[in-house]
Interface confidence: low
């Protein structure tokens, strides 16, 4: 059992290319940093894996379609939005996100767990910030993205709690 750090989340929803500059921000303390994650702030556009069956990102060939901002080939800083489960470990998911160029990984819990979060153990996948959020929060974000809304998350280090029991997948 180890201590766990919560994550402050500032999430914004914005409909792209409408000419409307107003963004709705939502601040909460609803995430927890992974046990092997850097304890650092990070921000980026949330991007789920491509394809309806790829939410768990357990296939090593999983891709992410990342928006561009600087020019036709330049990706914004982005955070992979991945669902827990699917037969692979947290480390597998986070490492895949890192390999694809994500600045962080946001893992959302299984369906049916509502807003429950757990401390993730992901040895070896230590290059990017990794947090877990609840299923309800993750599903809300995912559905927004699927409707064409750009969702951005700013993650800041919260408070220390613990000890909790670690989970690897």
């Amino acid at each position: 059992a180890e201590a766990v750090w919560t994550a402050y989340l500032n999430v914004s929803w914005r409909v792209p290319h409408t000419g409307v500059n107003r963004t709705v921000w939502e601040l909460s303390e609803e995430g927890v940093y992974g046990q092997d994650s850097p304890l650092e702030p990070v921000a980026g556009v949330l991007v789920p894996p491509d394809g309806p069956g790829a939410l768990n990102a357990c296939n090593p060939h999983t891709n992410f379609t990342v928006p561009t901002v600087w020019g036709s080939t330049v990706q914004v800083s982005w955070l992979a939005l991945i669902q827990r489960g699917g037969g692979c470990t947290f480390a597998d998911k986070i490492h895949l996100a890192y390999e694809r160029g994500a600045s962080g990984a946001v893992i959302f819990n299984f369906p049916g767990t509502r807003n429950e979060v757990i401390p993730m153990s992901h040895p070896g996948a230590v290059d990017i910030v990794a947090i877990m959020i609840g299923n309800l929060k993750g599903t809300k974000i995912l559905q927004s993205i699927q409707r064409g809304i750009q969702v951005t998350m700013v993650i800041e280090v919260g408070k220390k709690h613990g000890p909790w029991v670690n989970h690897y997948s």
Partner: nanobody
Framework: QVQLQESGGGLVQAGGSLRLSCAAS????????MGWYRQAPGKEREFVAA???????YYADSVKGRFTISRDNAKNTVYLQMNSLKPEDTAVYYC????????????WGQGTQVTVSS
């Protein structure tokens, strides 16, 4: 609000080098994507290089292998090392910072003039 202050521009002979700096100040709570654009006389502003939070770098084809972008996160500063400069690199160079609350709308610096003589 975010303010950007560029420096390092000037006049240099072809084949020479310059190092541009851009310091961001203001309401910055997390590290941001930062980059450089340029605008030559009579032309549109064009992308030069960018670096994201994860230190992934991007370059326009015209500057690959000659320009290097880097950043100092502690100082919220981005640098552009320009080597083997050519007359066609002559332009006003603009620093840009991408903020997450204004999608696709970077903050721009005032620009710094780079002139490469032949």
């Amino acid at each position: 609000q975010v303010q950007l202050q560029e420096s390092g521009g000037g006049l240099v002979q072809a084949g020479g080098s310059l190092r541009l700096s851009c310091a961001a100040s203001g309401n910055i709570s997390v590290q941001l994507d930062m980059g450089w654009y340029r605008q030559a006389p009579g032309k549109e502003r064009e992308f030069v290089a960018a670096i994201n939070q994860g230190t992934t770098t991007y370059y326009a084809d015209s500057v690959k292998g000659r320009f290097t972008i880097s950043r100092d996160n502690a100082k919220n500063t981005v640098y552009l090392q320009m080597n083997s400069l050519k007359p066609e690199d002559t332009a006003v160079y603009y620093c840009a910072v991408y903020l997450y609350d204004i999608w696709n709308h970077p903050y721009w610096g005032q620009g710094t003039q780079v002139t490469v003589s032949s």
